[in-house]
């Protein structure tokens, strides 16, 4: 079955860096847009970044643009999020999620990982 | 960006009763709206897309309705396992925005 497993979260100081990974299985990874969605403690969901199936096209929410880099390795069925210049407001559980492959499905996220916690604090 | 306002913030319902959750968009999203369920410590799960189409495997007691700016998620015959926070998401303007969530508690 479809599985997404995030890793790489942890405690980091403001200004620091972290690299998150998301290992995918149970589907043809290279066919799908994948994104990172985050959730600050006790808060709602916030889309962060998306990457096209080939990895050639990316898009970021403005608050992270220039600091975060989304990438993927289709040979390893893995998605990455390189986070630099981290701020306290980046503290959140980071989920990777698959955009549905359903024809005319739009930006619906049909499978999610369990999330990895990133804490930015001194 | 399109802002989604969910109400109420918290809803307390007895087992077997009906829960009605509202989501209002700041401008029309046609029917391009999804609902997700998130249980404590778990990832969100897609329930409804296209405002009213149930995702595969989602029980029939979950139903979505609405179009334009006003949407409703109805949970009939509420069960204990339905205790969760529910989020609406518009995808009219990619990649979409989420509402603030409605927490459903079981009395």
């Amino acid at each position: 079955q479809v599985q997404l497993v995030e890793s790489g979260g942890g405690l980091v100081q403001p200004g620091g860096s972290l690299r998150l990974s998301c290992a995918a299985s149970g589907f043809t990874f290279s066919y799908y847009d994948i994104q990172w969605v985050r959730q600050a403690p006790g808060k709602g969901l916030e889309w962060v970044s998306s990457i096209s199936p080939s990895g050639q096209s990316t898009y970021y929410r403005r608050e992270v643009k220039g600091r975060f880099t989304i990438s993927r390795d289709n040979s390893k069925n893995t998605l990455y999020l390189q986070m630099n210049s981290l701020r306290a407001e980046d503290t959140a559980v980071y989920y990777c999620a698959r955009r549905t492959g359903r024809e005319e499905g739009g930006w619906i996220f049909d499978y999610w990982g369990q999330g990895t916690l990133v804490t930015v604090s001194s | 960006e399109i802002v989604l306002t969910q109400s109420p913030a918290t809803l307390s319902v007895s087992p077997g009763e009906r829960a009605t959750l509202s989501c209002r968009a700041s401008r029309s999203v046609r029917r391009e709206l999804a609902w997700y369920q998130q249980k404590p410590g778990q990832a969100p799960e897609l329930l409804i897309y296209g405002a009213s189409t149930r995702e595969t495997g989602i029980p029939a007691r979950f139903s979505g309705s609405g179009s334009g700016t006003d949407f409703t998620l109805t949970i009939n015959s509420l069960e204990a396992e339905d205790a969760a926070t529910y989020y609406c998401q518009q995808y009219r303007d990619p990649p979409g925005t989420f509402g603030g969530g409605t927490k459903v508690e079981i009395k």
Epitope: S50, G105, G106 | E1, E32, Y91
Partner: antibody
Framework: REQLEESGGDLVKPEGSLTLTCTAS?????????VCWVRQAPGKGLEWIGC???????TAYASWAKGRFTISKTSSTTVTLQMTSLTAADTATYFC???????????WGPGTLVTVSS | DVVMTQTPASVSEPVGGTVTIKCQAS??????LAWYQQKPGQPPKLLID???DLASGVPSRFKGSGSGTEYTLTISALECADAATYYC????????????FGGGTEVVVK
């Protein structure tokens, strides 16, 4: 390498119809791209015609283009622009362009020339 | 539809000089603004998105700024290769408001 190429440009008589095709290579439209058509009359500026979100099928058109122009995703690598009731004012180079998630265009085709004349 | 008004229509500056191009939107487009460079016989090339973010490979001599309805492209240390026509473009809420280009500014390098 990801590329777009337009085809179908031709000399057509006034009131005639024409379908242009935008073909992707190095990637497919199975992802959610905005694929848009933009035209440029000889010696003039860029004019947006319309777009299709290849992931959802949503379309958006310039006010003046509604009714006469139709954008469709016809396969995982092709998007078409159907044009009807053509007039001399539609003479232009027609470009297709791609944006990811939003419609700023980091990939353009070289353009195809449409001439409407009797 | 959003309307983009671009000024001036043409500007001539010497090599090493600075060019400023302005673009006004008919409504607040929340910085969803791109700038393109187009040379004769070629398709446009993306220079800047989100009003101020340089596209990959674009030199830092190109600078975008602005918010709300008022946006500016500044080209400093002008080079001969910068001779081209420049267009602004809004892409705010495409499904609702569509896409709109400015009328273009021809930059002549003396």
């Amino acid at each position: 390498r990801e590329q777009l190429e337009e085809s179908g440009g031709d000399l057509v008589k006034p009131e005639g119809s024409l379908t242009l095709t935008c073909t992707a290579s190095g990637f497919s439209f199975s992802s959610s791209y905005w694929v848009c058509w933009v035209r440029q009359a000889p010696g003039k500026g860029l004019e947006w015609i319309g777009c299709i979100d290849t992931g959802s099928g949503n379309t958006a058109y310039a006010s003046w283009a509604k009714g006469r122009f139709t954008i469709s995703k016809t396969s995982s690598t092709t998007v078409t622009l159907q044009m009807t009731s053509l007039t001399a004012a539609d003479t232009a180079t027609y470009f297709c362009a791609r944006g990811y998630v939003v419609a700023h265009f980091n990939l353009w085709g070289p353009g195809t020339l449409v001439t409407v004349s009797s | 539809d959003v309307v983009m008004t671009q000024t001036p229509a043409s500007v001539s500056e010497p090599v090493g000089g600075t060019v400023t191009i302005k673009c006004q939107a008919s409504e607040d487009i929340e910085r969803y603004l791109a700038w393109y460079q187009q040379k004769p016989g070629q398709p446009p090339k993306l220079l800047i998105d989100d009003a101020s973010d340089l596209a990959s490979g674009v030199p830092s001599r190109f600078k975008g700024s602005g918010s709300g309805t008022e946006y500016t492209l500044t080209i400093s240390a002008l080079e001969c290769a910068d001779a081209a026509t420049y267009y602004c473009q809004s892409y705010y809420a495409i499904s609702t408001y569509g896409v709109a280009f400015g009328g273009g500014t021809e930059v002549v390098v003396k």
